[in-house]
Structures are given as structure tokens and as C-alpha cells.
């Protein structure tokens, strides 16, 4: 059904790192817009993005309202130039978005290693704990603010004459590992929710390695 | 050093709602440590129902998840409890804990390392 | 759930004997997560090692854990009067968390 001149949408994909969520589509539009609508599975639709020549939406604002909700979106296709225009069933086109529960699938986005401080034969490593878009008393949380204790971190870390890597872990976002004194080591760490099935880990961060700027040394 | 307090009715009628609060003295509840609640049915073992984060980001036993709320109020320096529908087999001791990072293999970790003292919860008509 | 099965349920044993209390898991747990508390009757528990064998600050050294995996163990090299109560095992690494059982010293 719908007008001759337009088409549904379809690919319709969730793009979400650590909880910007953007909706992304096909096909470019010919002759036509897109409005796309939101809704959790027992709310109101909320219409965002209007008649849009974008194949994206934005719709990290609604899902950072409870990012443990499930979401579902639709794309509705409008002739260009004539979005009153409906299909023959009365509406217009529209395609569903797969659903979408932001605390289970957001990715974890590439953590970054905040500094290094040896005091001997120890090292003190700190990720960075990032801001996310999610609001509580007006104030952005960060990722550990939002996920607790599902969150941890793996640290890798090899002395930097050799490959052989050693891990740790962490429920916090601090590491204190045991190195040989006089070596030089390098550092890079990982964000895992163990509990999740899917997008349970981020990429690796940028190699840290003892001897460059972030790091500091103390006997 | 940090002490908790539980506080609540002892007594609570069959399918309404308990509740309790703990309250956190000689420290921030906004840390860094998460705050929890136990409770020992008489005579036996402990039963984990659930934590909060000062964020507010919990986690629950799923045999409770449907009846439970676990609340945060930082300018209060408590974390409350609330149980729906109660029935005789509700009836515990419950006690509040923080749960502390510790230091192990290179990370840290966190343990239930200060208790409140229990407060004993009777649901009856 | 992680199940956790301490045994045996009662030990009876006498002041300065040595107790091996066993906790076994119903699958593996990263020893990471495992603690053991003491309760004594009345009383809240209290930690005693975390980290499957590590101490907690004060708890005297005739405590000791032990063990990985599924098996765990915590030992009291020489019972004082003041050890008898009731011993958890608990793991946090999986919600939920879980104690197991307990395993209560008496004195014999």
C-alpha cells in the first residue's frame, strides 16, 4: 500500500555508544521525507526528526529517560512537498525498528586511561570514568554512575621489552598491579559487562606506556 | 568509623508494603561504596534482596525484583527499602550493609564490611 | 543462581582444635568474589575474608580461606571460646548474590 511515489524505509538500525543513540536507515530519500516516531512498549509514540531528508535520527534524548526501558521506533515515508498525503490503507508508510533496551545494548565505548602513577613496585592505573547523556537531578552521569557494578574493567599490561601480557580486573575504575622495578611497562584496559549476551566489550584503549607524558613516578 | 541504622515498623499486615530506612553515619552514602539489604528469615540462613548505588543504579534478587524498590536519598545520607505485598514468609530480620571496595589480584572488589545491627520484621494480621 | 553448599552443617569440636569448613559452589565462581562471614547469635555478620583468602583488617590469623573454582575452604588453625558461631560463605560476583547455608562450631 501508499502512494506511488514513495517508499518504505528499511535497514533501520540501532547506532548506540555509550547511550547516544542515533537511528539509521535506507534508502536515501528520492522525492521524499521521513518523520520517525518513538515509543517504550507501553507509552505514547513521540514523533522526532520531521520530514527529514536525513536516513539518522538523534533519539538519545527520549532513551536516556529510563535506559532500562525497551524502545521501539518507526520510520514514516511522506511524498516530498506533500506530506499530508497518506497510503491507500489511510496512513502513510511506515517501517519498525528491531526493539531496542538501552542498559542491555548500548555499546561500551572506547575507554581511555586517565593516568599511571608508580610508587615503587607498584602501579596505580586510572580509567577514566566518562560522562554519558544520561540525566538524574539534573546533573550527567557517568558510565559507572549508570551501570554499578555490571561494569568492570580488564587492564592488559606487558613490560615494553617483551610481549607477554598479564590481565587484571576491576569493579572500580582503579588497577594496582605489581611490576619489576627499573621496567618499563605498558598499559591498555578494556570495559566488560560479563552479564550482558550481546556488546558485553568495548574496544581496547589507546596503549599507555611508562616513560611518556600521562604517567608519573615516585620512589 | 561508618554505622548503620535500620529503622522501620516491626510490625506489618499481610499484602501491604514494608518499609525501611538506613541510616548512614560517620561517612558520605556518595562515596563510592554501594549500600545493600539482607534478610535472615528466622533460624536460618541470609537472603541478598538487593543494592543501590548513590546514583541510584540498583540491582535485585530476581525472586524479589516485582515487589522491590530500593531507594537513595543523599542529602539525607539514607537508603530505604520498600517490599510490596507482603506475606508470613517476609518475616526476617533485615539488615542494611555497605559494600566497600577491596583491594585483590590487582583490582578492587566489593564486600558486604559494615553492617547495621537488624531490625526484626513480623508480617501479621 | 549460584547455589553455595557449606558442609558440614554443625562442627563440634573443643577450644584450641582445628576447624576446615567447606563451601562448594554449584558452578565455578572467579575467587574474586568470595567471602566469608561470621555471625554470632544475636549479632549482624561479620567479614572475615574476602578475596577467597584474604584477611580482613583485625581478624586474627588463625583464620585463614583457601581454594578456587567451585571448592572453598576456610580454616581456624586453633579455636578460642570466642570463635564458636556460625560461619557463611558467600559469592558476589552473580546476581544474585548468594550465602550458603552456614556452618555452625560448637563447642563440644
Known amino acids: 500500500s501508499g502512494t506511488t511515489n514513495t517508499v518504505a524505509a528499511y535497514n533501520l538500525t540501532w547506532k548506540s555508544t555509550n547511550f547516544k543513540t542515533i537511528l539509521e536507515w535506507e534508502p536515501k530519500p528520492v522525492n521524499q521525507v521521513y518523520t520517525v516516531q518513538i515509543s517504550t512498549k507501553s507509552g505514547d509514540w513521540k514523533s522526532k526528526c520531521f520530514y527529514t531528508t536525513d536516513t539518522e535520527c538523534d533519539l538519545t534524548d527520549e532513551i536516556v529517560k529510563d535506559v532500562n526501558q525497551t524502545y521501539l521506533a518507526r520510520v514514516f515515508s511522506y511524498p516530498a512537498g506533500n506530506v499530508e498525503s497518506t497510503g491507500s490503507a489511510g496512513e502513510p508508510l511506515y517501517e519498525n525498528s528491531p526493539e531496542f533496551t538501552p542498559y542491555l545494548e548500548t555499546n561500551l565505548g572506547q575507554p581511555t586511561i586517565q593516568s599511571f602513577e608508580q610508587v615503587g613496585t607498584k602501579v596505580n592505573v586510572t580509567v577514566e570514568d566518562e560522562r554519558t547523556l544520561v540525566r538524574r537531578n539534573n546533573t550527567f552521569l557517568s558510565l559507572r554512575d549508570v551501570f554499578g557494578k555490571d561494569l568492570i574493567y580488564t587492564l592488559y599490561y606487558w613490560k615494553s621489552s617483551s610481549s607477554g601480557k598479564k590481565t587484571a580486573k576491576t569493579n572500580t575504575n582503579e588497577f594496582l598491579i605489581d611490576v619489576d622495578k627499573g621496567e618499563n611497562y605498558c598499559f591498555s584496559v578494556q570495559a566488560v559487562i560479563p552479564s550482558r549476551t550481546v556488546n558485553r566489550k568495548s574496544t581496547d584503549s589507546p596503549v599507555e606506556c611508562m616513560g611518556q607524558e600521562k604517567g608519573e613516578f615516585r620512589e | 568509623q561508618v554505622q548503620l541504622q535500620e529503622s522501620g515498623p516491626g510490625l506489618v499486615k499481610p499484602s501491604q508494603t514494608l518499609s525501611l530506612t538506613c541510616t548512614v553515619s560517620g561517612g558520605s552514602i556518595s562515596s563510592g561504596q554501594y549500600w545493600s539489604w539482607i534478610r535472615q528469615h528466622p533460624g536460618k540462613g541470609l537472603e541478598w534482596i538487593g543494592e543501590i548505588y548513590y546514583s541510584g543504579s540498583t540491582r535485585y534478587n530476581p525472586s524479589l525484583k516485582s515487589r522491590v524498590t530500593i531507594s537513595v536519598d543523599t542529602s539525607k545520607n539514607q537508603f530505604s527499602l520498600k517490599l510490596s505485598s507482603v506475606t508470613a514468609a517476609d518475616t526476617a530480620v533485615y539488615y542494611c550493609?555497605?559494600?566497600?571496595?577491596?583491594?585483590?589480584?590487582?583490582?578492587?572488589?566489593?564486600?558486604?564490611?559494615?553492617w547495621g545491627k537488624g531490625t526484626t520484621v513480623t508480617v501479621s494480621s | 543462581e549460584i547455589v553455595l553448599t557449606q558442609s558440614p552443617g554443625t562442627l563440634s569440636l573443643s577450644p584450641g582444635e582445628r576447624a576446615t569448613l567447606s563451601c562448594r559452589a554449584s558452578?565455578?565462581?572467579?575467587?574474586?568474589?568470595l567471602a566469608w562471614y561470621q555471625q554470632k547469635p544475636g549479632q549482624a555478620p561479620r567479614l572475615l575474608i574476602y578475596?577467597?583468602?584474604t584477611r580482613q583488617t583485625g581478624i586474627p590469623d588463625r583464620f585463614s580461606g583457601s581454594g578456587s573454582g567451585t571448592d572453598f575452604t576456610l580454616t581456624i588453625s586453633r579455636l578460642e571460646p570466642e570463635d564458636f558461631a556460625v560461619y557463611y560463605c558467600q559469592q558476589a560476583g552473580v546476581v544474585p548474590y548468594t550465602f550458603g547455608g552456614g556452618t555452625k562450631v560448637e563447642i563440644k
Open positions: 558452578e565455578s565462581v572467579d575467587s574474586s568474589y
Open positions: 550493609a555497605r559494600d566497600a571496595p577491596y583491594y585483590y589480584g590487582g583490582g578492587y572488589y566489593y564486600y558486604m564490611d559494615v
Open positions: 578475596g577467597a583468602s
